[in-house]
Structure formats: C-alpha cells, structure tokens
Interface confidence: low
C-alpha cells in the first residue's frame, strides 16, 4: 500500500497586504479516513487556522468543496491578508479516532506579506543654521514588509552620501520601520533647495515614495551691510542710506542711531524676493547738518532673525562742510560681528 503523502507544493507564497492568499495542499490517498487541519507554526504552540468540521474561521475558505466525495484537494484561501498573518502554514492529516491522531504534516508553506511602507516623513533641524554649517534631516517610514528596502537622499537631484540608515527590528517581524539621517552642508544658495528622501520597496512596483523638506526652513543667510552718504542737499540735509542685502529669512529689524541715540526703528515686511530666495532692504535717514555743531556719527544697526546685532557706522562731517559732497562715500565698519559674505 502506497504511503500517504501530504503535498504542499509551494515552499513560500508572497502576498500583498489586503489581498487573498491561496495555500495549496493535496493528499495522495483517501486512506486512511480522517480530517485535514491547517495550522500556523509547528510544535505545541501552533495556531489552528482552519478545521473543516468545527470552529468559526470567517477569513478562511476552502478552494474546492471538501465535503465532495473523493476530494483530495484541501487548499485554503485566506482573505484580507495583513502583516500579522505572516508565518509558516502546515497542512496536517489526522487519522479518525477518539480523539483524532495526527498522521502526517505537509512540508509547510511560508506566507510572507508584502506591505507598503508609509509615506516617508522628513523632519529638519529645530533651529536655523548658516552657510557652511552641517544640518541633519531625518526620514522615517513604517509598516513595510519584507524587510528589504532602499532609502536614498537627494539634494536638488544629487544623491547625498553622508547618510546613516537603520531598519528595525533586526530580527523577524510582521512589519518593519526605517529611519535615516542625512547630514547636509548648507550653502548660501540653499534657500530654494530641497532635500528628498526616496524609499524603494518591492511593493511599490518601481515607483518610489518620496518625502521632502525645504532647506528654507533650516537656513539663515546673514545680511551684508553697507552705509553710504548721498550728495548734500541744498537745504543742508544729508541723505544716508543703509543697504541690507542677501539675507534670509525676512525677519529683520533695523535701527538708526545718531551719536548713540536711537533715531528710528523699522521692521522689514513684504520685501520682494531675490532670484536666490534672499531679500534686500534699503533704509534712508535724512540728517540736518545745520542742527549739529560737531560731526554726527550715524550707526545702522541690524538684528536679523533673533541673532546679535550687526552694526555699520558712518561719520557725517559737519565742520567746514562744502555745499556739495561726493556721492556714495563708503562707510567705516565698526560692527564687531559684521559678516562680509562676498
């Protein structure tokens, strides 16, 4: 008499989350009489998945009619697969008795569940940094399976190499998470730059998921200051301008000081944007020279984005001044923390 075989033809089956999985099982003989049961896992802790005779298994249906005479196909279909369904499934033949006795098990079919990674979420630094500094961006994606995944970082289309990536957990799990940190060196031209975290996974059919972050949220471009005197006007008034250029973000306060005393304070608002995303601002101060006996020391003081003030000073010569002075006289710089970025 030929020995009974329990045949599970697929060693492994991979199914996308939400789909149905078909687990095939046939037996080579109708003898001896007795039921077939499906289990997940082996040994004493195995979990009963399907038993034709009793129990309620709403997501499991037999592929062919198991009550049909001479049926030797005990394949099952599990609907609405989730990552929690992953594992090795065994088709087991029992000999009828009181109780039924386990006779033979199939070799097992490993069910792996392909679950898509969540959309990558990119977060940047909590505080802004200036050009030449390095900032870190973090990208996270969760809930994917299998574990194999690729994450790449790009800045303006160029792949970044200073990257550290971890996939958790290290061991077997129903689903996995990835976390990656990229270090980016800022340049002054990065106001319009973007970093992209690109996640490729078998479930995505070649269309990677992308998360983005704008470097405008991470960068501070400090201003360049220049104070110049325009021509003396006929009414003995001197027009002094303070040009504040190439700064980002727009949050900026400018204060004029005459001989150390606050003359006027202004806040930047609704400025036009330069092509590179930075801003320029020009402030004017009219000084009545005839109201002063001595030279006037004018200071343009700029506080940008909560940083320490930057100063540029200019001395207007009062004594023996001619009616016309040369235009666009460059200022002296007394700002100790001036950043000349050209």
């Amino acid at each position: 008499e030929e020995e009974l075989q329990v045949i599970q033809p697929e060693k492994s089956v991979s199914v996308a989350a939400g789909d149905s999985a078909t687990l095939n099982c046939t037996v080579s003989s109708l003898i001896p009489v007795g039921p077939i049961q499906w289990f997940r896992g082996a040994g004493p802790g195995r979990e009963l998945i399907y038993n034709l005779k009793e129990g309620h298994f709403p997501r499991v249906t037999p592929v062919s009619d198991p009550t049909k005479r001479n049926n030797m196909d005990f394949s099952i279909r599990i609907s609405n697969i989730t990552p929690a369904d992953a594992g090795t499934y065994y088709c087991v033949k029992f000999r009828k008795g009181s109780p039924d006795v386990e006779l033979k098990s199939g070799a097992g079919t490993e069910l792996s569940v392909r679950a898509k990674p969540s959309a990558p979420v990119v977060s940047g630094p909590a505080v802004r940094a200036t050009a030449e500094h390095t900032v870190s961006f973090t990208c996270e994606s969760h809930g994917f399976s299998p574990r194999d995944i690729t994450l790449k970082w790009f800045k303006n289309g160029n792949e970044l190499s200073d990257v550290q990536t971890n996939v958790d957990p290290a061991g077997k799990s129903v689903s996995y998470s990835i976390r990656s940190t990229a270090r980016v060196v800022l340049t002054r031209r990065d106001v319009h730059s973007q970093v992209i975290c690109e996640v490729a996974h078998v479930t995505l059919q070649g269309d990677p998921l992308r998360g983005t972050a704008n470097l405008s949220e991470a960068i501070r471009v400090p201003p360049f200051l220049e104070v110049t005197q325009q021509s003396m006007r006929a009414d003995n008034q001197v027009n002094v301008t303070c040009q504040v250029t190439k700064f980002y973000p727009q949050r900026l306060q400018l204060t004029w000081l005459e001989n150390g005393n606050v003359s006027r304070t202004e806040m930047a608002s609704a400025l036009p944007e330069n092509k590179d995303g930075t801003y320029n601002w020009t402030s004017w101060l009219l000084v009545n020279v005839s109201a002063h006996r001595d030279d006037v020391k004018l200071t343009c003081q700029v506080e940008h984005d909560g940083q320490p003030a930057v100063n540029k000073s200019f001395s207007v010569k009062v004594s023996a001044h001619p009616k016309e002075q040369g235009s666009n006289t460059a200022a002296e710089n007394t700002g100790t923390n001036e950043r000349n970025i050209y």
């Epitope: 490729a200 078998v202 070649g206």
Partner: antibody
C-alpha cells in the same frame, strides 16, 4: 564596484543559435531586474525585455517573442540571452542593463550597462 | 507603443557652449524618463533618471527637466568628453522605448 561583464563576440551562421551571458559583479543579481537591449549597426537602442531576477519570470517586448529566451543561473550570478534560428537581421550588439532601484522587478531606468556583445550572423 | 522623438537629430557645438536637447513623448509618461550618453564603440552611460535626477558621478553640468510629454537635457558648458550621442528613454509604459538619438559633434 558594480559591473556587468558580458561574454565575447560571436560569429554564427544563419539558423544557428547563440547564448550571450551577463555576469553581475559587486551586487546580488537577484536584487535588481535585468534588461536586454539591442543595437543594430549604425542604429539606435531597442529594448528587448527584462527578466525578474527574483522570480525568474521574463517579459518580452513585441518582436522578441519566440526565438529569444532570457534565463538566469543565480549560482554564478549570471543572466543569459539565447537567440535561436539566427537570421542576418539579428546582427547587432546586445547589451544587458540593470534596472535602477533595489527590488524594482520591472523594466525601468537603467543604472549599469554591460560592455556589449557583438553577434554577427553571416553565411 | 509610446514614440519618443528627439530634436535635433544632430548638432554641432563648441567647447564651453550651452547645449539643449529635447525629447517629446507621444503620450504622457509623467517623470518616468531617463537620459543616456553613448560614445562610438562603447556601451551607453546612464546620466539622468526620473527626468531630473543625476546619477552619482555624473557632472553637474548635465541637468534634466520636464514632465508629461516634453523633456530637455541641458549641458551647461560643453567639455571635450561630452561629444557623443544622447538618447532619451521612457519607462512609464511597456514596451520601454528610446528616442532615435541626438548626435553632438564638435563644430
């Protein structure tokens, strides 16, 4: 360093068959799909199809079904292109090219190319 | 099949020139477009994927742009080693198709 190393030039008679090999170096063959591209003398590039290196399933472009067979031997990290019943018009350089993207078992953008294998069919 | 049409078919330029090659798809291919460079007797070299992403090691003078049906490859300042034939390729729909190529020659 990643390389796709193809077998050398072949001179065949019409009606014969040829098998071109493409060995993957520097990465795991089964992690990326492998495409085949034909370039006839003085002509442009023509996609022949690809093989899913994970499952071994080939996909052929129209015009490359029947006489053309893509296969794998993962034990030696090699993909193969076999052409049967060779014709004069099969004379071309055949390239293997890897699909960009880990686990992209699809035709796609190609990041690495083999150096090409010239197959000449002449009586 | 999606037809890919490159223009011009050939062009002459000098070292230092800025050169633009265009590629038009007969149907929308999103950003599933790649660019390759091929020199005589050599295998193609991959330059750009996803319409605008440069591969590692590709000089920054090469840039790609476009989406949908119209795409461009720009070489900002031609170098002697850039004289070659350039191909675009769509990978949005099977069969994958290439443009007929643009031959860039020294003036």
């Amino acid at each position: 360093q990643i390389q796709l190393v193809q077998s050398g030039s072949e001179l065949k008679k019409p009606g014969a068959s040829v098998k071109v090999s493409c060995r993957a170096r520097g990465y795991t063959l089964t992690d990326y799909a492998m495409n085949w591209v034909r370039q006839a003398p003085g002509q442009g590039l023509e996609w022949m199809g690809f093989i899913n290196t994970y499952t071994g399933e080939p996909t052929y472009a129209q015009g490359f079904k029947g006489r053309f067979v893509f296969s794998l031997d993962t034990s030696v990290s090699t993909a193969y292109l076999q052409i049967g019943s060779l014709k004069a018009e099969d004379t071309a350089v055949y390239y293997c090219a890897r699909t960009r993207g880990y686990y992209d078992f699809d035709g796609g953008a190609f990041d690495y190319w083999g150096q090409g294998t010239l197959v000449t069919v002449s009586s | 099949d999606i037809q890919m049409t490159q223009s011009p078919s050939s062009l002459s330029a000098s070292v230092g020139d800025r050169v633009t090659i265009t590629c038009r798809a007969s149907q929308n291919v999103g950003t599933h477009l790649a660019w390759y460079q091929q020199k005589p007797g050599k295998a193609p070299k991959s330059l750009i994927y996803s319409a605008s992403y440069r591969y590692i090691g590709v000089p920054s003078r090469f840039s790609g742009s476009g989406s949908g049906t119209d795409f461009t490859l720009t070489i900002s300042s031609l170098q002697p080693e850039d004289f070659a034939t350039y191909y675009c390729q769509q990978y949005n729909t099977y069969p994958l198709t290439f443009g007929q190529g643009t031959k860039l020659e020294i003036k």
